[in-house]
């Protein structure tokens, strides 16, 4: 075929042409060149920059038998789903013997209806707290203007007119949805519906009442739940452990706490089945028929000693001459607290009762007035705590010590009148 | 608005010439590749010749091969298919016609045509 | 040379039909077939090109589709206006060619 300079000619028959649509398009881009010889490789260019991973194929078709006949090229280049970073100036580029040849330019642009970026999400708030719901949309074309819903019912006259990308909400005292619109010129789209539920705010002002050694009373002060009545509010109590470090705000305790339910009205707690001179930490929830409220902080509370339930075991009380030895053991019973010591009396049978702070130790040694001739002597011990005085053991005669002989020791006759105390763990 | 108008048919004798003229107005003429299409009598559609907006690169089918050429005058944005040693098979309606931007071999405007009569 | 076969020359069609016209390659044309159409008197006008892209002002009733060596060119709704002969071309490699046309005509 008769051809001019044609070097200097580009030998691109078929130039990239335009795509303009919605996001999720799939569209085609093709260059077709008609050269003499071997067939270049065609490169494809986005805005000047060669596309590595371009997803293209070439084709290739002699037009001839002979090696220097002419060769049609094609380059199709797919765009799978359109999406904005796919926008841009497209172009084709061959390397011709010393020459580069450049394709003229085709254009993918974006034009549909707004696109969002973000979007209102599910959440809880507390009843008559302000909070902030975000919404964020795109074209082109540009400009998007959003319009917020509340309960399907505008926030604005008109698009754009209200509150664009952050919609802050002074307070609800009902669950309620929220979405927004996003206008632009070819149309309208509507983000997800968000729900915002309403739960009751947090209680105030959990305080003790009272305080027993197994038992501690407590109240608070119940926070706005919106229009949905209160069910319910839930204390739960943990034993305090110097390792554990419960502060407000910190994650749970590892251990299980203990967990209570009150009835609302009134708010107020009698919490049993404590230790006795235990630090505790407590917090409360209340509920509605939307869910809970966020848990107060961790209030460390502590139950007060007691005194000891049982008396010391294993009294021996034996009689030399004018000295008398009695022995004991640490009550069985819980001490209630911590023992700051004992309490012995005797007595014998026509005088005044003797009584004596003996302390932590548990054996004494008394020397007995006179020749020793007080008949029916008899001798009672007592722990006792912070608190006060434990039971009183029961009566033990004093008895004369034989040598030879080992200590008579003496049972209790009597157990004490409320069986040793066992522990729920929880 | 794009247009084409071919001048230059008539009636002819076999082994005779022509030059037919393609005047266009409307584009930037010279962005463009340009192609001749004729029809027969029968309604036939047959491709005559392919130039490139440089004029550098032209293209005939191997029926025309050396008896027609094609050129063109940017400066004067004008077409020209000299046709000699022509035969009875060339009588046909002439088009010119313009090349899309994304296939030139596609042609996305037509002139309304001359007629050329090949016969004694 | 690349053959471009419009089996029909003729197809009747009733107002409002859908109808397709075919046109067969003779070998793979990487879908570059162009679709044209002549009403008496006129010179031919554009209305496809790369087998599916539509020329601008063309009526959206008229879609092109196919791949490989087979192409179609649908009108959804026949108008009246639409009464014409029907080309395919292949503008994938010189020499240019053509179909032998489809004339659409009413029932």
């Known amino acids: 075929a008769p051809r001019g300079t044609q070097a200097e000619e580009s030998p691109f028959v078929g130039n990239p042409g335009n795509i303009t649509g919605a996001r999720g398009l799939t569209g085609t881009l093709r260059c077709q060149l008609q050269v003499q010889g071997e067939p270049p490789e065609v490169h494809w260019l986005r805005d000047g920059q060669i596309l590595e991973l371009a997803d293209s194929t070439q084709t290739q078709v002699p037009l001839g038998e002979d090696e220097q006949d002419d060769w049609i090229v094609v380059s199709q280049l797919r765009i799978t789903s359109l999406q904005l970073s796919d926008t841009g100036q497209y172009q084709c580029l061959v390397f011709l013997g010393h020459q580069t040849f450049v394709s003229q330019p085709g254009y993918v642009g974006l034009e549909g209806l707004p696109y969002f970026l973000e979007e209102p999400e599910d959440r809880t708030v507390a009843a008559n707290t302000p909070f902030n719901l975000s919404c964020q949309a795109q074209g082109p074309p540009e400009p998007v203007d959003l319009l917020w819903l509340q309960d399907a019912v505008p926030l604005a006259t008109a698009p754009g007119h209200g509150p664009q990308r952050s919609l802050h909400v002074p307070g609800l005292n009902k669950t309620s949805s929220f979405s927004c619109e996003a206008h632009n010129a070819k149309g309208v789209t509507t983000s997800r519906t968000a729900t915002i539920t309403v739960l009751p705010q947090q209680p105030r002002n959990l305080h003790l009442v009272s305080r027993q050694p197994t038992e501690l009373e407590v109240a608070w002060t119940p926070g706005l739940s919106g229009i949905y009545p209160l069910t319910h509010c839930t204390l739960q109590a943990v034993l305090s452990d110097d390792g554990m470090g419960i502060q407000a705000g910190e994650p749970d305790p590892p251990e299980e706490p203990l967990t209570s339910q009150a009835s609302v009205p009134p708010h107020q707690l009698r919490l049993g089945s404590l230790h006795p001179h235990t630090p505790y930490h407590i917090r409360v929830a209340c509920t509605s028929s939307q869910g809970p409220s966020s848990w107060t902080h961790w209030l460390p509370v502590e139950t007060p000693e007691g005194v000891p339930l049982g008396p010391p075991e294993n009294i021996s009380a034996t009689r030399n001459g004018s000295q008398a030895f009695v022995h004991w053991q640490e009550p069985r019973a819980p001490l209630q607290g911590t023992l700051l010591g004992y309490r012995l009396a005797y007595q014998g049978q026509d005088t005044p009762e003797v009584l004596m702070d003996i302390g932590l130790r548990q054996e004494v040694t008394l020397e007995l007035q006179g020749d020793g001739s007080v008949s029916n002597l008899t001798v009672c011990v007592a722990a006792y705590t912070a608190a006060g005085d434990g039971p009183w053991s029961l009566p033990v005669p004093l008895e004369a010590w034989r040598p030879g002989q080992a200590q008579p020791v003496h049972q209790l006759v009597k157990e004490p009148s409320t069986p040793a105390f066992s522990w729920p763990w929880w | 608005e794009v247009k084409l108008v071919e001048s230059g048919g008539g009636l002819v004798q076999p082994g005779g010439s022509l030059k037919l003229s393609c005047a266009a107005s409307?584009?930037?003429?010279?962005?463009?590749?340009m192609s001749w299409v004729r029809q027969t009598p029968e309604k036939r559609l047959e491709w005559v010749a392919y130039?490139?907006?440089?004029?550098?690169?032209?293209y005939y089918p191997d029926t025309i091969k050396g008896r027609f050429t094609l050129s063109r005058d940017n400066d004067r944005n004008t077409l020209y298919l000299q046709m000699s040693s022509l035969k009875s098979e060339d009588t046909a309606m002439y088009y010119c016609?313009?090349?899309?931007?994304?296939?030139?071999?596609?042609?996305?405007?037509w002139g309304q045509g001359t007629s050329v009569t090949v016969s004694s | 040379d690349i053959v471009m076969t419009q089996s029909h020359k003729f197809m009747s069609t009733s107002l409002g039909d859908r109808i397709s016209i075919t046109c067969k390659a003779s070998q793979d044309v990487i879908t570059a077939v162009a679709w044209y159409q002549q009403k008496p008197g006129q010179s031919p006008k554009l209305l496809i090109y790369w087998a599916s892209t539509r020329h601008t002002g063309v009526p959206d009733r008229f879609t092109g589709s196919g791949s490989g060596t087979d192409y179609n060119l649908t009108i959804s709704s026949v108008q009246a206006e639409d009464l014409a002969l029907y080309y395919c071309?292949?503008?994938?490699?010189?020499?240019?060619?053509f179909g032998a046309g489809t004339k659409l005509e009413l029932k």
């Open positions: 130039i490139s907006n440089g004029g550098g690169r032209t």
């Open positions: 016609a313009r090349g899309t931007t994304e296939s030139y071999y596609a042609l996305d405007y």
């Open positions: 071309q292949q503008h994938f490699s010189t020499p240019l060619t």
């Open positions: 409307g584009f930037t003429f010279n962005s463009y590749s």
